[in-house]
Amino acid sequence: QLPPGKPEIFKCRSPNKETFTCWWRPGTDGGLPTNYSLTYHREGETLMHECPDYITGGPNSCHFGKQYTSMWRTYIMMVNATNQMGSSFSDELYVDVTYIVQPDPPLELAVEVKQPEDRKPYLWIKWSPPTLIDLKTGWFTLLYEIRLKPEKAAEWEIHFAGQQTEFKILSLHPGQKYLVQVRCKPDHGYWSAWSPATFIQIPSDFTMND
């Protein structure tokens, strides 16, 4: 029977800069029941606080609700593991909410084949930003990426869409069924997961050439 091993805070993520969650990996438990607590203070302050919500983020997590999430402030946090034989502390982690945003995937992905009479046909792709993100405040710039491939192909073709929420693709294989997905990331932060795939059948008369 031993004191617990050193825990590690390995990830913090925010869906929208308004709340965030951090997760830790326990060290060895020393063969005894072990309690974990996450404590932190904000840069420029010395008053320590404890994790307000150990439940929402699942096991070995701390969720910071709106009233605990401060923009433009760095959080300095650590996890304490304690059993009957002693305690151990994780290294301190410095967290700035601005840099840990990972949005939900974009919504309402719509894909349509457009075949104008006077121009080349194209695939028209449209989507909406995730609901948790408020783009009107100006705090967020979301960038988008599209990927698509024929259903049976191994390789994805990736297109960067910038800030726009619609995109045209001209070069497609006629008669093929395509999978299309979109994801987003803030200017600072992490790519979202890919949206659920939307399928589109490309007509056999879809011409790639002039």
């Epitope: 607590s37 404590t39 904000r42 420029g44 302050e45 010395t46 008053l47 320590m48 606080h49 404890e50 994790c51 307000p52 919500d53 150990y54 609700g65 709106k66 009233q67 605990y68 401060s70 304490n80």
Partner: antibody, heavy 118, light 106 residues
Framework: EVQLVESGGGLVQPGGSLRLSCAAS????????MNWVRQAPGKGLEWVAY????????YYADSVKGRFTISRDNSKNTLYLQMNSLRAEDTAVYYC???????????WGQGTLVTVSS | DIQMTQSPSSLSASVGDRVTITCRAS?????LHWYQQKPGKAPKLWIY???KLASGVPSRFSGSGSGNDYTLTISSLQPEDFATYYC?????????FGQGTKVEIK
Amino acid sequence: EVQLVESGGGLVQPGGSLRLSCAASGFTFSSFGMNWVRQAPGKGLEWVAYISSGSSIIYYADSVKGRFTISRDNSKNTLYLQMNSLRAEDTAVYYCTRFYGYIPFDYWGQGTLVTVSS
Amino acid sequence: DIQMTQSPSSLSASVGDRVTITCRASSSLIYLHWYQQKPGKAPKLWIYDTSKLASGVPSRFSGSGSGNDYTLTISSLQPEDFATYYCFQGSGYPLTFGQGTKVEIK
């Protein structure tokens, strides 16, 4: 509606003990840091003690350190202050208050009077 | 310890007057908070994070400042504003109040 209701105050002799309680309702008690603040008759406010949401962090004012113990029972939504070795200068109204995020003392109880006198 | 010094400790003013209370911290703060207390009542949060008015606080109140120096201003004093005001720092242990400023009727 957030409510904090203190109880347990009264008259006690110097050197005696008293345990104050604060019953909380109307919010998720286990998510909030809690405090005791006191006010001697005709004097200003003095912070006494702080306890974090899960009791991992506890702070005391120097004037009560070693004599007072703050604790909480999240299953009962109750905050406590065990006061030992009481002195005349501990005579005050004791208020239970909460930390809302980083906003200190957004709600206060009505207070309970502790009188230390022989 | 961070000492909080309020001035003045008391003031007399008339309804309609502009009133300013100052609070100086012995160490630089990021935020400062203000509380209002009336005789026989529990204090109330009045201004938090230096300049944000608590729920129900009239807009004639304002807070400002940074670093070591902070002010609470009442633009036009009303009868219900006569009370004692306390500044407070919750950034560092031990948590500390100013000694209070009593606003009385002239």
